[in-house]
């Protein structure tokens, strides 16, 4: 079998004139492409891998949101020679860019990386970026992740930065076919220059505060209960409560009203992400949909 | 939740123009991102014009370009596509479509909820 071959990490990597043509191994008897786009409010990019696949034949799309990241992801397997180039890559996945100007900035500021390589996108260097409200989302929290694309034995992968709805989500991630977007969120202006060690300690977890020993009393009607004022006694380490499989927690902070209507529940997905997927759990959604292959 | 619903499909000659509309009931029209999408018999649902809660992002098929154009009435709570210079191949089941982002979304899979869509005919 002989198969297109690239990969694209926010440039023209696989246009017509830098794709290769790779014969396969031996028993490999699908050609795959693979197209991830990543959107904040602040724009968009894409990855694209091409090359020899693994698995059956058939298509999968499935869109993601996590904390107002969108994320769209394309795998396509397919058996005959080179007929891995069918996906536009460079056509717009997810929305246009609006007029930014419209919108009034929130106060927030966060560095923005939205197709920019890992040199470019460290510490303080990446550009700044005013975060504004879109609809009744508000956008105060500022991101610093990753997405990874993995097809035909390839693993790509670019940081991600920007505006996100939650100011305190850590080392939180969706994933699709062969595909991964993850990191942390922060609370205040440019807080996103490295979130990589960022642990679980967050003002929604309440303190643990430690209580007087009761003193011994002979009248227990006259004793007035005083509890401590001293300083809260944080606990050493934390551990991430992981979300039910079965069941999807509900976002906390910012909610969009629409969103607490009776819904089908999804099943899976980390807390406070939507995993938009066409794989008939909203039949409703999109039209008729064809079926999974399990080759993707 | 919000209930859609189409109207203005019909039956017209080639080069003439249809006013399709939506009306929204429910909660917040206003703070959703909508949609035109359309389904020819055979072919996937492929987006048509999308616009943002405000209004202010408007994405447009490269197919209708010049030729439709999307607005809403947020006061209103509908959605307009106002189509010209129909062809032939803008035939289908138009749909009206919502999704919580806000945004001018260009992928189905982003949108939460759906009408039940309107025919347009384009034939002489």
């Known amino acids: 079998l002989e198969c297109y071959s690239c990969v694209q990490k926010a440039d023209d990597g696989c246009s017509p004139n830098k794709m290769k043509t790779v014969k396969c191994a031996p028993g490999v008897d699908v050609c795959t492409e693979a197209v991830g786009a990543v959107e904040t409010i602040h724009g968009q990019f894409s990855l694209a891998v091409r090359g020899c696949g693994s698995g059956l034949p058939g298509k999968n799309d499935r869109g993601l949101d996590l904390h107002g990241l969108l994320a769209f992801i394309q795998l396509q397997q397919c058996a005959q020679d080179r007929c891995n180039a069918k996906l536009n890559l460079t056509s717009r996945a997810l929305d246009p860019a609006g007029n930014e100007s419209a919108y009034p900035p929130n106060g927030v500021e966060c560095y923005s990386c939205v197709g920019l390589s890992r040199e470019a996108c460290q510490g303080t260097s990446p550009p700044v970026v005013s975060c504004y409200n879109a609809s009744d989302h508000v956008y105060k929290g500022c991101f610093d992740g990753n997405v990874t694309l993995t097809a035909a034995n390839v693993t790509v992968s670019l940081p991600v930065r920007g505006c996100v709805q939650d100011e305190f989500c850590t080392r939180d991630g969706v994933t699709g076919p062969g595909f991964t977007l993850s990191g942390s969120c922060c609370q205040g202006s440019r807080c996103n220059s490295d979130l990589r060690n960022k642990t679980y300690f967050s003002p929604r977890i309440p303190p643990l505060v430690r209580l007087p020993p009761p003193e011994p009393t002979t009248v227990a009607s006259t004793t007035s209960v005083t509890t401590s004022t001293s300083a809260p006694v944080r606990p050493t380490s934390t551990t991430k409560p992981m979300p039910a499989p079965t069941s999807q927690t509900p976002r906390q902070g910012v909610e969009h009203e629409a969103s607490r209507d009776e819904e089908p529940r999804l099943t899976g997905g980390a807390a406070g992400h939507q995993d938009r997927s066409n794989s008939g759990q909203y039949p409703a959604k999109g039209g008729p949909q064809q079926p999974h292959n399990k080759g993707c | 939740q919000v209930q859609l619903v189409e109207s203005g499909g019909g039956l017209v000659q080639p080069g003439g123009s249809l006013r399709l509309s939506c009306a929204a009931s429910?909660?917040?029209?206003?703070?959703?991102?909508m949609g035109w999408f359309r389904q020819a018999p055979g072919k996937e649902r492929e987006i048509v014009a999308a616009?943002?809660?405000?209004?202010?992002?408007?994405y447009y098929a490269n197919s209708v370009k010049g030729r439709f154009t999307i607005s809403r009435d947020n006061s209103k709570n509908t959605l307009y596509l106002q189509m010209n210079s129909l062809r032939a191949e803008d035939t289908a089941v138009y749909y009206c479509?919502?999704?919580?982002?806000?945004?001018?979304?260009?992928?189905?899979?982003?949108?939460?909820?759906w009408g039940q869509g309107t025919l347009v005919t384009v034939s002489s």
């Open positions: 616009i943002s809660w405000g209004g202010s992002a408007v």
């Open positions: 479509a919502a999704n919580r982002q806000g945004r001018a979304l260009v992928r189905k899979e982003f949108y939460d909820y």
């Open positions: 429910g909660r917040s029209f206003s703070s959703y991102g």
